[in-house]
């Protein structure tokens, strides 16, 4: 289809991407599915500038991003290289902690209350952020 020049209604434009910020919670996989059904993906943070933008909009609330290590190495959902890319982990994180008693370790990354990242149990119902590139975004999405 033809490229779009503005973000869908209720999405926020920033640096040629469109962002949607949830106000309720889902497990990581369910949040991922939500974004996909919107022709988007969980947010991929590629710079300190983007980190600050997202952090400003989500506030001090645990919020999923598009980063996980469910299949071994850490991977961004859009294929962005993790090893050479931007990172903002809390000290001592990620730690794949098993002490939560929920079974398994911690395979999904989220923004913490101070914006830095932590790995946590993917089933926790956190808020999330969807992102889509501006030239892929529709102009008039459903009202949310």
């Amino acid at each position: 289809g033809s490229e779009r020049t503005c973000c869908p209604v209720n999405w926020v434009e920033h640096e040629r991407s469109c962002y949607w910020f949830s106000r309720s919670g889902k497990a990581w996989a369910d949040a991922d599915n939500y974004c996909r059904l919107e022709d988007a993906h969980l947010v991929v943070v590629t710079s300190w500038e983007e980190q600050k933008f997202v952090q400003h909009h989500i506030g001090p609330v645990n919020t999923w991003m598009g980063l996980h290590d469910q299949n071994g190495p850490w991977k961004w959902v859009d294929g962005t290289d993790y090893e050479t890319g931007f990172k903002n982990w809390r000290p001592e994180q990620p730690d794949d902690w098993y002490g939560h008693g929920l079974g398994g370790g911690e395979d999904c990354a989220h923004f913490t209350d101070d914006g830095r990242w932590n790995d946590d149990v993917c089933q926790r119902p956190y808020r999330w952020v969807c992102e889509t590139e501006l030239d892929k975004a529709s102009q008039e999405p459903p009202l949310l």
Epitope: S24, A29, R36, E38, D39, S138, E140
Partner: antibody, heavy 120, light 107 residues
């Protein structure tokens, strides 16, 4: 006024195929995810499949995965459901439903449905 | 899959009655719950979403509540046009699933 009109239902033998269509009007079709939901006689509602605005992402109920294919043509404001390898248990009224709130997904408008009967 | 179980399966009531329908999820659904009304031969109508948000145009006698796995639809004063089948739906996880329906009949 939002309208969803299904067509393509009918009687088909087990193992056969049908293609359902849903013609949409009264809203900007290309900006909403869409779903198919079915209701077997005397039974409750069952979600069948969903498709994203562009058609690039799809989801299916396990009961139809590998047999049914959802698609859409935004230039024609039409949603489709290709149904292959039909079984008796697929007998139901099939309705298309519009996503009202993004990928939530709650359905704020539904079609009246088209009856699919699978019988020999 | 998340199973949605409604009770009762049917209820007989009179105009003006308060009617309560419950829906129980087999696991937590993070408040991703909707209620629909369906009349014979008609398309379902969205009444409530997000547990308690009233869809535009739906009368205020309909209300929803609950959290976790247990949810309730209440009709505060039943009207003649409310005799129908009511279904809950979870939208937390694929596959989205519905309750089996509760038929509200005239006593």
């Amino acid at each position: 006024e939002v309208q969803l009109l299904e067509s393509g239902g009918g009687l088909v033998q087990p193992g056969g195929s049908l293609r359902l269509s849903c013609a949409a009007s009264g809203f900007t079709f290309s900006t909403y995810a869409m779903s198919w939901v079915r209701q077997a006689p005397g039974k409750g509602l069952e979600w069948v499949s969903a498709i994203s605005r562009s058609g690039g992402n799809t989801h299916y109920a396990d009961s139809v995965k590998g047999r049914f294919t959802i698609s859409r043509d935004n230039s024609k404001n039409t949603l489709y459901l290709q149904m292959n390898s039909l079984r008796a248990e697929d007998t139901a009224v099939y309705s298309c439903a519009k996503d009202g709130f993004g990928g939530s997904s709650y359905f704020d408008y539904w079609g009246q449905g088209t009856l699919v009967t699978v019988s020999s | 899959d998340i199973q949605m179980t409604q009770s009762p399966s049917s209820v007989s009531a009179s105009v003006g009655d308060r009617v309560t329908i419950t829906c129980r999820a087999s696991q937590g659904i993070n408040n991703w719950l909707a209620w629909y009304q369906q009349k014979p031969g008609k398309a379902p109508k969205l009444l409530i979403y997000g547990v308690s948000s009233l869809q535009s145009g739906v009368p205020s006698r309909f209300s929803g509540s609950g959290s976790g796995t247990d949810f309730t639809l209440t009709i505060s004063s039943l009207q003649p046009e409310d005799f129908a089948t009511y279904s809950c739906q979870q939208a937390n996880s694929f596959p989205w699933t519905f309750g089996q329906g509760t038929k509200v009949e005239i006593r």
